[in-house]
Interface confidence: medium
Amino acid sequence: SERCDDWGLDTMRQIQVFEDEPARIKCPLFEHFLKFNYSTAHSAGLTLIWYWTRQDRDLEEPINFRLPENRISKEKDVLWFRPTLLNDTGNYTCMLRNTTYCSKVAFPLEVVQKDSCFNSPMKLPVHKLYIEYGIQRITCPNVDGYFPSSVKPTITWYMGCYKIQNFNNVIPEGMNLSFLIALISNNGNYTCVVTYPENGRTFHLTRTLTVKVVGSPKNAVPPVIHSPNDHVVYEKEPGEELLIPCTVYFSFLMDSRNEVWWTIDGKKPDDITIDVTINESISHSRTEDETRTQILSIKKVTSEDLKRSYVCHARSAKGEVAKAAKVKQKVPAPRYTVELACGFGAT
C-alpha cells in the first residue's frame, strides 16, 4: 500500500464508553491533527474509512456496518454505536484518503461495565463547587449530538445509588442539577441518566461525575506563612545540622498555582555553592485548602552559613509573601577551668 501519514495511536484520547449505551465518536484527525474539517475534506473528494483492531489482537479488520438494527454506523466524521457491546473494545482507526493523499490516526476505545449503582472503572471528571456560595449548577456532560432538539428526553439524577428526590439542598432541573448551598456533605458521585427514544427504541446515556466541595473565593486570603516566625530562633553551633521548616497555608483558589521557595542571601539554593537540601510535603484540608512545608536542611553548618539570610517565599493568585528565619550562631558558654599558678608548687 502507498505511503500514508500515520499519526500512530493517540493514547491522549483514551475513550471510555458504557456497555449497552449509544456512543458517538468523532474521528480525531479533524479535531487535533489536520487543519481542515470533515466538510472541506469531503468536498475535496477525500473519503473517511474506519477500521479497528480487537482487544488482544494484531489484525486490523474493517468495521461491520451491516449489523442488525444498524448497531454500528458512520455519519460524516462520527462513528456511532447504537448501542455498544463489551467486545467492541479495541483500537479504532480513521483514515482520510483519495488517490494522492492519505492520513490516519488510531485511538483506543474501552467499553466499560457498570453496575446498577453506576460503579465502574470509568475515569470520572471532577466538578468543584464552592462551599456555602449560593446556587451553583452542574450539567449532565457529553450528551450533545445524541438526539435532535425536537426530542425531549427523560433525565434522572442520582447521588451514588439513590435517586435525587426531596433532597434538602439539591434540586434536579432537567439537564442541570442545582445545589442551593453546597456543603461538605454534598461531596460524592452524581449520575444523570438520559433516556430518549429513537426509531422505536429507547436508549440510555449514563454520565457520572465527582462533585468536590472546595473553599470559597469569598474566604480566600493571600498565603499565610506559619513558619518561620518571630518566636523561633534557630541557634546552632558550627558542625551541627540546620533544619528550618517553611510551612505555608494556601486558601483554595480555582486554577491557582501555589508556590513555596527558599532564598539564601537572596539567591535560589541551586545558585549557591553550599550543600543544602530541600524536602517538600503537601497536605490538604477537606475543602482543598493546601498546606505546603519545605524543610531546608544543611547537614554540617558552618559559621559562615549561620550569618546568611534564609527567607521563605510563597505565592498564589492572591499574592506573594516572604518571611526570614532567625538564624544565629550559638555563643559558647564560658569554661570554668582550674589553672595552676606560680608559687603554688610543692617545695
Epitope: 435517586k163 433516556t195 422505536g200 440510555h204
Partner: antibody, heavy 118, light 110 residues
Framework: SVEESGGRLVTPGTPLTLTCTVS????????MSWVRQAPGKGLEWIGS?????STYYATWARGRFTISKSSTTVDLKMTSLTTEDTATYFC????????????????WGPGTLVTVSS | AFEMTQTPSSVSEPVGGTVTIKCQAS??????LSWYQQKPGQRPKLLIY???TLASGVPSRFKGSGSGTEFTLTISGVESADAATYYC????????????FGGGTEVVVK
C-alpha cells in the same frame, strides 16, 4: 430451553445458589433474568445479566442477591435468606435486540421452589 | 422509585364478553411494555411486547395499546381458556426499579 435447579427447603440465614441451565441459547446474545413469585402473590423481578455481562438488580435485591453467568448457566446466589424469600424462582430469557427488548421475557423456565423455614 | 400500577386487581366476565385491563407507569416508558398471562401452577407466557405487538402464536383477540405512561390490554370475545392472571411489565429501564411488573389482574370467565 431454560431450566432452573437448586431450590430446596433451607433455614433462615442459609445461603443458597440456584442455577439456570440453558440449551440452544447463546448467552453472549441474550440477557437472562431471575424473577420470583411468592405463594399466591405476583411476579417480582430480582435482576438481570445482559449479553455483555453487566448485572442489574431490583433496589431491594442489591447486596443480597448476585447473578453470574457462564457459557451455558446463569447462577443466582442468595444470602441471608428469610421466610419472606419463600417463592418459586423463575429464570427467563430476554428477547434479542437492545435496551428495552432484553427485559421482555419470551422464554421462561418451569421454576424452582425455595422454602425458607425454621 | 419507578412503579407500575395495574387495575383492576380482579375482573369477572362471561364468555364472549370483553375484558379491559389498564396499566400505568409512574414515568414515561415510551412503548416498552409487555403483557404476560399466567395460569395457576404454570410459568408466565409472553402475550404482547412493545405495547401492541402480539407474541408468536397469540390469538388476535388479545390487543395491546397505549404509549408513554398509559397502557391497555383488551381481550375481545373472551374464552374460558383466557381465565388466568395477567401482568404488565415495563422494559424501558433497569435503574432504580423496585419491580417492573404490575401487581396482576385475575380474570375469571363465567
Amino acid at each position: 430451553s431454560v431450566e432452573e435447579s437448586g431450590g430446596r427447603l433451607v433455614t433462615p440465614g442459609t445461603p443458597l445458589t440456584l442455577t439456570c441451565t440453558v440449551s440452544g441459547i447463546d448467552l453472549s446474545n441474550y440477557a437472562m433474568s431471575w424473577v420470583r413469585q411468592a405463594p399466591g402473590k405476583g411476579l417480582e423481578w430480582i435482576g438481570s445479566v445482559i449479553s455483555g455481562g453487566s448485572t442489574y438488580y431490583a433496589t431491594w435485591a442489591r447486596g443480597r442477591f448476585t447473578i453470574s453467568k457462564s457459557s451455558t448457566t446463569v447462577d443466582l446466589k442468595m444470602t441471608s435468606l428469610t421466610t419472606e424469600d419463600t417463592a418459586t424462582y423463575f429464570c427467563a430469557r430476554g428477547c434479542p435486540g437492545y435496551n428495552g427488548d432484553k427485559y421482555t421475557f419470551d422464554l421462561w423456565g418451569p421454576g424452582t421452589l425455595v422454602t425458607v423455614s425454621s | 422509585a419507578f412503579e407500575m400500577t395495574q387495575t383492576p386487581s380482579s375482573v369477572s366476565e362471561p364468555v364472549g364478553g370483553t375484558v379491559t385491563i389498564k396499566c400505568q407507569a409512574s414515568q414515561s416508558i415510551y412503548n416498552y411494555l409487555s403483557w404476560y398471562q399466567q395460569k395457576p401452577g404454570q410459568r408466565p407466557k409472553l402475550l404482547i411486547y412493545r405495547a401492541s405487538t402480539l407474541a408468536s402464536g397469540v390469538p388476535s383477540r388479545f390487543k395491546g395499546s397505549g404509549s408513554g405512561t398509559e397502557f391497555t390490554l383488551t381481550i375481545s370475545g373472551v374464552e374460558s381458556a383466557d381465565a388466568a392472571t395477567y401482568y404488565c411489565q415495563q422494559g424501558a429501564t433497569s435503574y432504580d426499579i423496585e419491580n417492573p411488573f404490575g401487581g396482576g389482574t385475575e380474570v375469571v370467565v363465567k
